[in-house]
Interface confidence: low
């Protein structure tokens, strides 16, 4: 024999049983209809008929290509989403009776919205720009400008910026500076050797010239047998047109695109981004 709970011994319990109050709320997975609580249909099933005093809720499974993803009282199942190939869509995950189909974009395309209702082509990064982040099915390509020391000479949805070739590691010298769209052009070492040798030769010629001028000045002096008075240091006058006679601040020569460029003292010998481009 089933034992009644203590409160059911009280009159209140008896009165409730004799005059049941219509429920105003139902338990989880139930719904209120005609003043009574009926069971909801489980996911994957639709409602055929509500429960009565004597019968349970009647449910039927969803048909093929249909689904219901919650406990429900729907009389019709929802159609699975159609991944329309004409909109660039394909099935990422096939739907079941309890889940909808998930669409994504064809390779090379990405969704135009979070719901992925249609697709557009991935953007390509123009020359001078590289791919920072390759596009996915839901996000477009992210491009970035190639920084100094890097270049991209193609329009691509995949290529990153490539570093300039290092001529030094190949025992070559830079013949043409790189830009954000072009690689550096390397060439043989001969130019560098010439750059070192030519100033040395000029230096030697200059020294010889100095010696000749000095000898010439000394030779011009009258030969006096008298004892030499103490001589003041003699100032040497250089001809104005001699190389190196300019007494301006020292300068440094550098190569830019095969042309010697005068580098100001105190300015770093680095070619600016504008100059590179």
């Amino acid at each position: 024999m089933v034992r009644l709970p203590l409160q059911c011994v009280l009159w209140g319990c008896l009165l409730t049983a004799v005059h049941p109050e219509p429920p105003t709320a139902c338990r989880e997975k139930q719904y209120l209809i005609n003043s009574q609580c009926c069971s909801l249909c489980q996911p994957g099933q639709k409602l055929v008929s509500d429960c009565t005093e004597f019968t349970e809720t009647e449910c039927l499974p969803c048909g093929e290509s249909e689904f219901l993803d919650t406990w429900n009282r729907e009389t019709h199942c929802h159609q699975h989403k159609y991944c329309d190939p004409n909109l660039g869509l394909r099935v990422q995950q096939k739907g079941t009776s309890e889940t909808d189909t998930i669409c994504t974009c064809e390779e090379g395309w990405h969704c135009t919205s979070e719901a992925c209702e249609s697709c557009v082509l991935h953007r390509s990064c123009s020359p001078g720009f590289g791919v920072k982040q390759i596009a996915t099915g839901v996000s477009d390509t992210i491009c970035e400008p190639c920084p100094v020391g890097f270049f991209s000479n193609v329009s691509s949805a995949f290529e990153k910026c490539h570093p300039w070739t290092s001529c030094e590691t190949k025992d070559l010298v830079v013949q043409q500076a790189g830009t954000n769209k072009t690689d550096v052009v390397c060439g043989p070492q001969d130019r560098l050797r010439a750059l070192v040798v030519i100033p040395i030769i000029f230096g030697i010629l200059f020294a010889i010239l100095l010696v000749l001028v000095f000898i010439k000045k000394v030779a011009k002096k009258p030969t006096n047998k008298a004892p030499h008075p103490k001589q003041e240091p003699q100032e040497i006058n250089f001809p104005d047109d001699l190389p190196g006679s300019n007494t301006a601040a020292p300068v440094q020569e550098t190569l830019h695109g095969c042309q010697p460029v005068t580098q100001e003292d105190g300015k770093e010998s680095r070619i600016s981004v504008q100059e590179r481009q």
Epitope: P85, N86, L87, G88, E106, E107, G108, W109, L121, H122
Partner: antibody
Framework: QLQLQESGPGLVRPSETLSLTCSVS??????????WGWIRQPPGKGLEWIGS???????YYNPSLKSRVTISVDTSKNQFSLKLNSVTAADTAVYYC??????????????WGQGTMVTVSS | DIQMTQSPSSLSASVGDRVTITCRAS??????LNWYQQKPGKAPKLLIY???SLQSGVPSRFSGSGSGTDFTLTISSLQPEDFATYYC??????????FGQGTRLEIK
């Protein structure tokens, strides 16, 4: 400059298979930007789209011809091909290959080959 | 399939005339409509795409308009080289892409 050139036999016997190839020059087919399609035109009549192929192997066909058509794309040779089975006299037409561009993925055929006449006759 | 109906099926006009060809879709195709010109023995050439956008290299006397189901191709001042057959084509609901039956434009 992109050019398309159809090639294949000009005469096919009824019930046999019509096979055509389209060679693409001036651009790589290994790109996600285009579909490569076949369109035909019976003598004195209008244009009928047969189907299209994508570089990754996806194909779309005209439902009216679907059971008889195969389109394949060979990016290594920069070619795509059409096979139409069980031909009849009604398949006699000029066959064009074309590059198709969005909108709507297989949208506008905007570059065409010059066409090749195929006659179905015994 | 979406049916495309062109009118008229043929028309005669003179050089300098303004000519209009219409195309009607059996259901709404938004603005996914293209127009082609075909000369005898040649492949069709795309003139207008997306209802009103002029294809690169096409003379500006050609223009397209319309959206939904009704579209028009207009040639503002007919030139001798414009005598040809014109086709409309929908790319909204595909496959298949479908063409109109064509409009033959002849010299009067």
């Amino acid at each position: 400059q992109l050019q398309l050139q159809e090639s294949g036999p000009g005469l096919v016997r009824p019930s046999e298979t019509l096979s055509l190839t389209c060679s693409v020059s001036g651009a790589s087919m290994n790109t996600n930007n285009y579909y490569w399609g076949w369109i035909r035109q019976p003598p004195g009549k209008g244009l009928e789209w047969i189907g299209s192929g994508y570089y990754n192997g996806n194909t779309y066909y005209n439902p009216s011809l679907k059971s008889r058509v195969t389109i394949s794309v060979d990016t290594s040779k920069n070619q795509f091909s059409l096979k139409l089975n069980s031909v009849t006299a009604a398949d006699t037409a000029v066959y064009y290959c074309a590059r198709q561009t969005p909108p709507r993925i297989i949208g506008s055929p905007n570059i065409w080959g010059q066409g090749t006449m195929v006659t179905v006759s015994s | 399939d979406i049916q495309m109906t062109q009118s008229p099926s043929s028309l005669s006009a003179s050089v300098g005339d303004r000519v209009t060809i219409t195309c009607r879709a059996s259901q709404s195709i938004s603005s996914y409509l293209n127009w082609y010109q075909q000369k005898p023995g040649k492949a069709p050439k795309l003139l207008i795409y997306a209802a009103s956008s002029l294809q690169s290299g096409v003379p500006s006397r050609f223009s397209g308009s319309g959206s939904g189901t009704d579209f028009t191709l207009t040639i503002s001042s007919l030139q001798p080289e414009d005598f040809a057959t014109y086709y409309c084509q929908q790319s909204y609901s595909t496959p298949p892409i479908t063409f109109g039956q064509g409009t033959r434009l002849e010299i009067k």
